[in-house]
């Protein structure tokens, strides 16, 4: 029987800069029941606080609700693992909520084949930003990426769309059924999951030349 091994806070995510959750990985348990507590302070403060909510994020997590979340202030946190034989502490983790946003996927993905008489045909893709993200305040800049492939192909073709919420693709294989998905990322932060796939049948008379 031994003191617990060193835990590690390995991930923090926020859906929208208003709340966030951090997760830790326990060290070895030392063969005894182990209690974990997360403590934190904000930069410039010395007062330590304990995690406000160990439940919402699931096992080995700490959730910071709206009243505990402030932007532009670095949180300095650590996890303490304790059993009957002793304690061990994780390394301190410095967290700025602005940098840990992982939004929901974009919404309302629409895909259409456009065949104008005077120009080359193209695939027109349009979507909306996720609802939790308030783009009007200017706090967020979302970047978008599109991926598509013929239904039976192994490789995805990826296009970076920048801040646009629509995109045109010219080079497609006629007669193929394509899968299309989109994802988004704040200027600082993490890519969302890919949106659910939308399928589009490219007409056989779709000409690329």
């Amino acid at each position: 029987q031994l003191p617990p091994g060193k835990p590690e806070i390995f991930k923090c995510r926020s859906p929208n800069k208003e709340t966030f959750t951090c997760w830790w990985r326990p060290g070895t348990d030392g063969g005894l029941p182990t209690n974990y507590s997360l403590t934190y302070h904000r930069e410039g403060e010395t007062l330590m606080h304990e995690c406000p909510d160990y439940i919402t994020g699931g096992p080995n997590s700490c959730h910071f609700g709206k009243q505990y979340t402030s932007m532009w202030r670095t949180y300095i946190m650590m996890v303490n693992a304790t059993n009957q034989m002793g304690s061990s502490f994780s390394d301190e983790l410095y967290v700025d909520v602005t940098y840990i946003v992982q939004p929901d996927p974009p919404l309302e993905l629409a895909v259409e084949v456009k065949q104008p008489e005077d120009r080359k045909p193209y695939l027109w893709i349009k979507w909306s930003p996720p609802t939790l993200i308030d783009l009007k305040t200017g706090w967020f800049t979302l970047l978008y990426e599109i991926r598509l492939k013929p239904e039976k192909a192994a490789e995805w073709e990826i296009h970076f769309a920048g801040q646009q919420t629509e995109f045109k693709i010219l080079s497609l294989h006629p007669g193929q059924k394509y899968l299309v998905q989109v994802r988004c990322k704040p200027d600082h932060g993490y890519w969302s999951a890919w949106s659910p796939a939308t399928f589009i049948q490219i007409p056989s008379d779709f000409t690329m030349n």
Partner: antibody, heavy 120, light 107 residues
Amino acid sequence: QVQLVQSGAEVKKPGSSVKVSCKASGYTFTTYWMHWVRQAPGQGLEWMGEIDPSDSYSNYNQKFKDRVTITADKSTSTAYMELSSLRSEDTAVYYCARNGGLGPAWFSYWGQGTLVTVSS
Amino acid sequence: EIVMTQSPATLSVSPGERATLSCKASQYVGTAVAWYQQKPGQAPRLLIYSASNRYTGIPARFSGSGSGTEFTLTISSLQSEDFAVYYCQQYSSYPWTFGGGTKVEIK
């Protein structure tokens, strides 16, 4: 404890490429951005670029944009910096540096440095 | 890009004395400034982040101040191990940039 161990010194010819590695240990590699900074002999520090090892998303200093490629291999917890079209001015010590936290780009852990000498 | 200008280039100080290093940014950077110490043949070591926050394990004799475009690193009472080169760095906008360094040498 956190360690960043870089590959050994290299001597390269002008026009060739060099690839420097940085093996991370003591923490979860995908948690923190990794940066590359260089220092010419007797000179100051110059940031080259950065990568998020969780998804290999990268940003570069425009000065190096066409010549530098930063990659990360999650399976071996190793970051790489490749610099092409080498010239004598690229002679420098190249450092990998780990982001200080989940936040802005200040660097709390540094590799030991790799000296790259470009000479004909 | 934002240019970080450090002064003086060299500072001669006696052990036990106070050292004041200056760093000026060419544009507003808020408090997005870090300070590093580098000794010959070694990698830089982080001292201060967010202009005034001491990093874990850094002695209290190191302090940072300033915001906007003017920043200061103060070493209240120089110890023998503090003689080194000091760099400021801004992380307000890409590309992240460093000052040219101030060498603190023994007087």
